[in-house]
């Protein structure tokens, strides 16, 4: 099919670059003839260092090709992304980042974990890819619910907490108010809506401290709020239904033995919060002496019968409703309770299956007489709000 054009010279035979091939292969290439270069799998077309998706050259009248020959260069995925709170190891060889090289991501042991196995391979598209086909690096998620606390300790009727007992405990300080919260991720705090309602439009004025036992300790980790999310069903000053809020922190905090999120309840957790099951609440609120606690105090308290609690409060404060979004805890005989200044703190339970602590309740409201007989503490029932919590966290 070759037609030698007048006054035109044939072009030099194109030589396929290493790891590449040329098509079509012809005995001679003359004016307007063309060839394309294709690279083997794991190699890419580069013109200098610039990637090309395809390459076709055309023979010109003067007997030269209109484009310089590219190369087929081995795919290089480049240095893998850094992993916050983790590290990457080169498996194939030191700093080897080319096609089929393998790397292994790992999280800092004890305090962080990843959902995948962390193994990534440099694939032909030039991206580090996991066995599940993920192109983004894994995430080191904070471990939740690890504590040195054990149930059985005999706030009001409480005992001082030891280091590592309640690493999720957060102190919320306003100009004139103090409340608590629970770390549920490395940049999210769960608390009671009523405790932060006044700050909702001025989040930055809320001072958040964590990693402390002594309320006035100078050795705290400071966190600043970015935004406060009050549950849309909460009406300030009209009862305590939906008394739940989330605080997004400006920065992620580093997780360690004294700062760690509490777990959120699994679906199966409802069975661990039945009447008479024991939970633990900690706080710097009023103690039996009527003074704010200097040291973080905790108390182990049983879940109260919901109907009995509802009846008590109907009698005590007519018009104040104990809703299905609340759970009550305390002894019929009194003596163990949370109190003013504990608001927003977590009522936690040990999940026997996972051996992790999860938040079942948020300190919400109760009788003016903390720890009085037959007058239970009322807590926001967190399990009812898991979809709300997950929705806020995933969207913001």
């Amino acid at each position: 099919h070759h037609h030698h054009h007048h006054a035109s010279r044939p072009c030099p035979d194109p030589t396929a670059p290493p790891n590449g091939s040329i098509s079509p292969v012809q005995a001679i290439y003359v004016l307007k003839d063309r060839f394309s270069v294709f690279c083997k799998t794991g190699f890419e077309l580069l013109q200098g260092s610039v990637p090309l998706k395809s390459f076709t050259a055309v023979c010109q009248k003067d007997g030269s090709w209109d484009r310089p020959m590219p190369e087929c260069s081995i795919i290089d995925c480049g240095p893998p992304d850094d992993l916050p709170n983790g590290h990457v190891d080169y498996i194939t060889g030191p700093e080897v980042t080319t096609y089929k090289a393998v790397i292994q991501y790992s999280c800092e042991e004890t305090f962080y974990t990843m959902s995948s196995n962390g193994k990534y391979v440099c694939e032909a598209d030039g991206f580090w890819t996991s066995s599940k086909g993920e192109k983004l690096p894994p995430v080191c998620e904070p471990v939740c619910g690890l504590s040195t606390h054990t149930i059985g300790g005999r706030i009001v009727g409480g005992q001082p907490a030891k280091p590592g007992d309640f690493p999720w405990q957060v102190l919320l300080l306003g100009q004139t108010t103090a409340a608590a919260g629970a770390l549920i991720h490395d940049n999210w705090v769960l608390t009671a809506a009523h405790a932060v309602y006044e700050k909702r439009m001025a989040a930055s004025s809320l001072n958040i401290r964590m990693g402390i036992l002594k309320r006035l300790s100078p050795h705290y980790t400071q966190a600043w709020p970015e935004e406060i999310f009050i549950h849309e069903g909460y009406t300030h000053g009209a009862g305590f239904d939906n008394d739940i809020a989330l605080i997004k922190l400006k920065n992620k905090v580093t997780i360690n033995g004294s700062i760690m999120p509490v777990c959120l309840p699994r679906k199966e957790a409802a069975s661990l919060m039945r009447t008479d099951f024991t939970g633990t609440v900690a706080g710097w609120g009023l103690t039996q002496k009527g003074l704010l606690a200097r040291n973080l105090m905790f108390v182990d308290i049983p879940i109260a019968d919901h109907q009995k609690c509802t009846a008590v409060y109907e009698k005590l404060y007519p018009g104040v409703r104990v809703s299905a979004n609340m759970l009550c805890a305390g002894l019929e005989t009194g003596g163990k309770d949370s109190c003013r200044g504990d608001a927003g703190g977590a009522l936690v339970f040990l999940d026997n299956e996972t051996q992790r602590w999860f938040v079942g309740g948020i300190v919400s409201w109760g009788s003016i007489n903390c720890g009085a007989a037959d007058q239970y503490g009322v807590y926001t029932k967190v399990i009812n709000y898991i979809p709300w919590i997950e929705n806020i966290i995933s969207n913001f």
Partner: antibody, heavy 117, light 112 residues
Framework: EVQLQESGPGLVKPSQSLSLACTVT?????????WHWIRQFPGNKLEWMGF???????NYNPPLTSRISITRDTSKNQFFLQLNSVTTEDTATYYC??????????WGQGTLVTVSA | NVLMTQTPLSLPVSLGDQASISCRSS???????????LEWYMQKPGQSPKLLIY???RRFSGVPDRFSGSGSGTDFTLKISRVEAEDLGVYYC?????????FGAGTKLELK
Amino acid sequence: EVQLQESGPGLVKPSQSLSLACTVTGYSITSDYAWHWIRQFPGNKLEWMGFISYSGRTNYNPPLTSRISITRDTSKNQFFLQLNSVTTEDTATYYCARSYDYWFGYWGQGTLVTVSA
Amino acid sequence: NVLMTQTPLSLPVSLGDQASISCRSSQSLVHSNGNTYLEWYMQKPGQSPKLLIYTVSRRFSGVPDRFSGSGSGTDFTLKISRVEAEDLGVYYCFQGSHVPVTFGAGTKLELK
């Protein structure tokens, strides 16, 4: 014919991030080639900053690696430059460009970015 | 980094003259694939640079044939056979063989 147009704020405060967009018309940024950012300092010195390829892979000028990110939005046929922790030394005219068998065959008209308190 | 040194920094010419700009690189620009990625760009005041020549001697589309490029290894030249008014501006050589790629400081072509 392919056309490129830079856009973004003309004034950035020191220590903040500089963010620019390059809108491409007449050619899809996923079809082929590499898409570059280049800057020209007062005094006319030119510096290549980095590129994003048709496949989305990036290559940066080593001194800028810790501060630069080039990303894209294929649905809008745009690619972006983000330069963090800027100083007055980052004051320049920023250009986007496209390569072929050469590095910069097609250029945008450039946008001046001043870094000043 | 490869240093690109242009001479002269300023080149006064008369219209119709031949102009020659030299560019020297601090190391060979022959790429491992055998090509030499040396390019020339021209910039007029208030405009973006425009590509004139690539891989030493190939003219970019639409570039008049009065522009020619030559050289090898570390020494390269851009010639304009007959300077026209529209050719006045700043000329930059550029190397794309070694990353990071680098530009020369520029040569200003101006009227005598």
